[in-house]
């Protein structure tokens, strides 16, 4: 069975060209979207960034693993891009747009 | 695989006295923690509390299924509760926990 | 009271197809995590599968050795829980077990008789 | 070869106590998980007999009791009897897929 790492943030770099996005985002051309992924699993040591729910639900989890899921692996903290696009009536508009950056993961 | 419903908040007590915690906490005897489960899958609706994060993540989990997971059903709102308890030194203690009740569950 | 009963075993050849059925009665079936457990003649008992309750969304499992010839479903309006073997092999011949999951600490605490499956040719 | 690790025989007088050992590993019993116990009398199914390391459904006697220690779980039989004689079962759950895992299974002998 696969075995999982732990908890952490995966860099990834988004191409807007591949969403299809191209013909309204300017720019930029792309960004460094980055991802959660790993286990959230006992013990939730301190780089997991657990919170007091997420050491709860593990707990029940390991005594009652087929009704209680494990927590999940999440973002933590998110950081806002900004993006120049045409808008439906094709004026350039230069907008902030937030949480579209992961920073860090944790277990929730 | 699995075919799971749309994330959302499940209902969950918890008995301290499962958790082997019944000697230190005094009071209460367990909580309604409730945890989050479900899938976050295209198209990421309202209900689902989605960041803008995991909306990209979603259209890219959707080109590269094998690379990048989708993002994860985790709480969105979490409450605290009061836990009367001893401490090292058997003083009783009563401490406000933060982030031990989800409210409310979205994807991320 | 809780019961489990198994039906559908039988003599099948290698390469066949096979359903097994397990009729649940004496509990709210929609609301358990319900397994398939086997037990080759004369071995130890052997994990198959499970299925989930609606609330999560009828999720399935499956052990390596049966991963893409079985299939787990259930029927909550029928209380019945179903196994479909596909493309069967010697090795499979057992007694399967359906077997309830009790919700607070995850035990089997309720098993069906069992039911005998021979693949032979 | 099952995940965890059982002696394939015990065995014991009336009136004695044996222990059933169930060796797992860190992603099984010492990756936190529940460990439970099951009798299967000849001829019958499986029947729980201990849940959580170490608790006893109604109608168990206390005679069974169960236990868990890092990646090791273990079962003891006190005042032994004969319709005690049965294969006994411990099972739990792989961390990685949260899959279930038994163990190989123990023929426990009442002698005499």
């Known amino acids: 069975s696969e075995l999982k790492t732990a908890c952490k943030k995966h860099e990834l770099y988004v191409s807007f060209q591949d969403l299809g996005w191209q013909d309204w985002i300017i720019a930029p051309k792309g960004y460094a979207a980055n991802y959660c992924d790993g286990e959230c699993s006992f013990p939730l040591n301190a780089h997991m960034n657990a919170t007091n729910h997420a050491i709860v639900q593990t707990l029940v989890h390991l005594m009652n693993p087929e009704y209680v899921p494990k927590p999940c692996c999440a973002p933590t903290k998110l950081n806002a891009i900004s993006v120049l696009y045409f808008d439906d009536n094709s004026n350039v508009i230069l907008k902030k747009y937030r949480n579209m950056v992961v920073r860090a993961c944790g277990c929730h | 695989s699995e075919l799971k419903t749309a994330c959302k908040k499940h209902e969950l007590y918890v008995s301290f006295q499962d958790l082997g915690w019944q000697d230190w906490i005094i009071a209460p005897k367990g909580y309604a923690a409730n945890y989050c489960d479900g899938e976050c899958s295209f198209p990421l609706n309202a209900h689902m509390n989605a960041t803008n994060h995991a909306i990209v993540q979603t259209l890219v989990h959707l080109m590269n299924p094998e690379y990048v997971p989708k993002p994860c059903c985790a709480p969105t709102k979490l409450n605290a509760i009061s836990v009367l308890y001893f401490d090292d030194n058997s003083n009783v203690i009563l401490k406000k926990y933060r982030n031990m009740v989800v409210r409310a569950c979205g994807c991320h | 009271q809780v019961q489990l009963v198994e039906s559908g075993g039988g003599l099948v050849k290698p390469g066949g197809s096979l359903r097994l059925s397990c009729a649940a009665s004496g509990f709210t079936f929609s609301s358990y995590v319900v397994h398939w457990v086997r037990q080759a003649p004369g071995k130890g008992l052997e994990w198959v599968g499970r299925?989930?309750?609606?609330?999560?969304?009828?999720?399935?499992s499956y052990a390596a050795p049966v991963k893409g010839r079985f299939t787990i479903s259930r029927d909550d309006s029928k209380n019945t829980l179903y196994l479909q073997m596909n493309s069967l092999k010697t090795e499979d011949t057992a007694v399967y077990y359906c077997?309830?999951?009790?919700?607070?600490?995850?035990?089997?605490?309720?098993w069906g008789q069992g039911t005998l499956v021979t693949v032979s040719s | 070869q099952s995940v965890l690790t059982q002696p394939p025989s015990v065995s014991g007088a009336p009136g004695q106590r044996v222990t059933i050992s169930c060796t797992g590993s860190?992603?099984?019993?010492?990756?936190?998980?529940?460990v439970h116990w099951y009798q299967q009398l000849p001829g019958t199914a499986p029947k729980l007999l201990i849940y959580g390391q170490s608790e006893r459904p109604s109608g168990v006697p206390d005679r069974f009791s169960g236990s868990k220690s890092g990646t090791s779980a273990s079962l003891a039989i006190t005042g032994l009897q004969a319709e005690d004689e049965a294969d006994y079962y411990c099972q739990s759950w792989d961390s990685s897929q949260t899959l279930v895992v038994f163990g190989g299974g123990t023929k426990l002998t009442v002698l005499g």
């Open positions: 299925t989930r309750h609606s609330d999560m969304g009828y999720a399935t």
């Open positions: 077997a309830r999951v009790e919700r607070s600490k995850s035990g089997f605490d309720n």
């Open positions: 860190s992603s099984n019993i010492g990756a936190g998980y529940s």
